[in-house]
């Protein structure tokens, strides 16, 4: 039994942290294999976590942690048994994929006006809770063309629009993600898309 | 109320041992890092020993190696440190510490401290 | 083994004024892992910042840490009376435990 594909980490720097490998074959990850792990850091101790089957030779293991400092480092040792298969280290901090945002909600009543709101995936005594920013994705379902992304750049998690930059009497849906710019991180997953009907009064026309 | 509550100080002639105790109340002993500071009569905070959630790992200052043992008894919510060979310089107020995880090393839970007098 | 000195030894300070406790480490470590204590006679130690600048619960916001590297700082920004006492900081690291020998902050 061997490694094809080394492990590789990403953290959500907050409790998780999801490392993924390939066995050069067939493995029942949750049976045959275990990562070790253990935070570098006068008497932490080992943590075991039992891996899930991530494709036929692919494996999985979501690594559970207290929190999240930038200096962490920990040490990962990959088990079948016991023979050692796979040494390594990483650092939380600079694998970051942030939490997908949720709770996104579309407030049509404003004067014409689309009003964007989600919730912060994480607590304010989070690091990464005043870094984030966000890109919201809208689309139409009636025509895939209309496809378009804003980024939102400031720290508030919301987004006004003018209803009328949009198509009337059509639905469209929505999702947002984030990134945190001070670790360099991957984009979030999107968050659950949510629906609505766009209408809006047209101006009158003058003649 | 979080409290831990050393004891078992007192006068001891230099070589000989002294076992000190510290009960926890008010949390689970077993989800925290415990360790023993101590104080000498007008000086500083010194570090003396430290042991691991499960007693796995334990860890000494340089000046106490080879003479203390540190131990713990987590379903009794218990720690202790066994002193043998003890010298004038241990004289001191030894406290009682816990450490949060999340603090990362802050010592955010202290005992009042038991005194540990050598002398002959 | 990391070495931290705490400068001032004695700090001579009037209430209201603004205090500044320096703490240098013989090499450059983590900021996660400095914290800071205060100490009155007779008592235990309590714990101010850890993380170098995050209070611990509890703790008034004219107490405040920062620093990076090899240089640390312990501000209180208006001195109280309940305030003059003992400060320590203290690197809790990977591999050691080690204290700076104090500051006394006394009244003026």
């Known amino acids: 039994m061997k490694v094809l594909q080394e492990p590789t980490c990403v953290s959500d720097y907050m409790s998780i942290s999801t490392c993924e490998w390939k066995m050069n074959g067939p493995t029942n990850c949750s049976t045959e294999l275990r990562l070790l792990y253990q935070l570098v850091f006068l008497l932490s101790e080992a943590h075991t976590c039992i891996p899930e089957n991530n494709g036929g030779a692919g494996c999985v293991c979501h690594l559970l942690m207290d929190d999240v400092v930038s200096a962490d480092n920990y040490t990962l040792d990959l088990w079948a048994g016991q023979q050692l298969l796979w040494k390594g280290s990483f650092k939380p901090s600079e694998h970051v994929k942030p939490r997908a945002p949720g709770n996104l909600t579309v407030h049509t009543n404003v004067s014409d006006t689309l009003l964007l709101t989600w919730s912060n995936p994480y607590p304010p005594d989070n690091y990464l809770y005043n870094h984030l920013t966000y890109a919201v994705n809208i689309w139409s379902e009636n025509d895939p063309a209309d496809f378009r992304i804003y980024n939102v750049t400031y720290l508030e998690p919301s987004l006004r629009i003018a209803a009328s930059t949009l198509k009337s009497g059509i639905s469209y849906r929505a999702r947002v993600r984030a990134w945190a710019q001070c670790y360099n991180t991957t984009w979030s997953e999107w968050s659950p898309s949510t629906k609505w009907h766009n209408s809006y009064r047209e101006p009158f026309e003058q003649h | 109320e979080v409290q831990l509550l050393e004891s078992g100080g007192g006068l001891v002639q230099p070589g000989g041992s002294l076992r000190l105790s510290c009960a926890a109340s008010?949390?689970?002993?077993?989800?925290?890092?415990m360790h023993w500071v101590r104080q000498a009569p007008g000086k500083g905070l010194e570090y003396v020993s430290g042991?691991?959630?499960?007693?796995?790992?334990?860890y000494y200052a340089n000046s106490v190696k080879g003479r203390f043992t540190i131990s713990r008894d987590n379903p009794k919510n218990t720690l202790f440190l066994q002193m043998s060979s003890l010298r004038a310089e241990d004289t001191a107020v030894y406290y009682c510490?816990?450490?949060?995880?999340?603090?990362?090393?802050?010592?955010?839970?202290w005992g009042q401290g038991t005194t540990v007098t050598v002398s002959s | 083994e990391i070495v931290l000195t705490q400068s001032p030894g004695t700090l001579s300070l009037s209430p209201g004024e603004r205090a500044t406790l320096s703490c240098r480490a013989s090499?450059?470590?983590?900021?996660?892992?400095l914290a800071w204590y205060q100490q009155k006679p007779g008592q235990a130690p309590r714990l101010l910042i850890y993380?170098?600048?995050r209070r611990a619960t509890g703790i008034p916001d004219r107490f405040s840490g920062s620093g990076s590297g090899t240089d640390f700082t312990l501000t209180i920004s208006r001195l109280e009376p309940e305030d003059f006492a003992v400060y320590y900081c203290?690197?809790?690291?990977?591999?050691?435990?080690?204290f700076g020998q104090g500051t006394k902050l006394e009244i003026k």
């Open positions: 510490v816990r450490v949060k995880r999340r603090y990362r090393g802050g010592m955010d839970v």
């Open positions: 993380g170098t600048s």
């Open positions: 042991i691991s959630h499960s007693g796995n790992s334990t």
């Open positions: 203290q690197l809790y690291g990977a591999t050691s435990v080690t």
């Open positions: 090499q450059s470590v983590s900021t996660a892992y």
């Open positions: 008010g949390f689970t002993l077993s989800s925290y890092a």
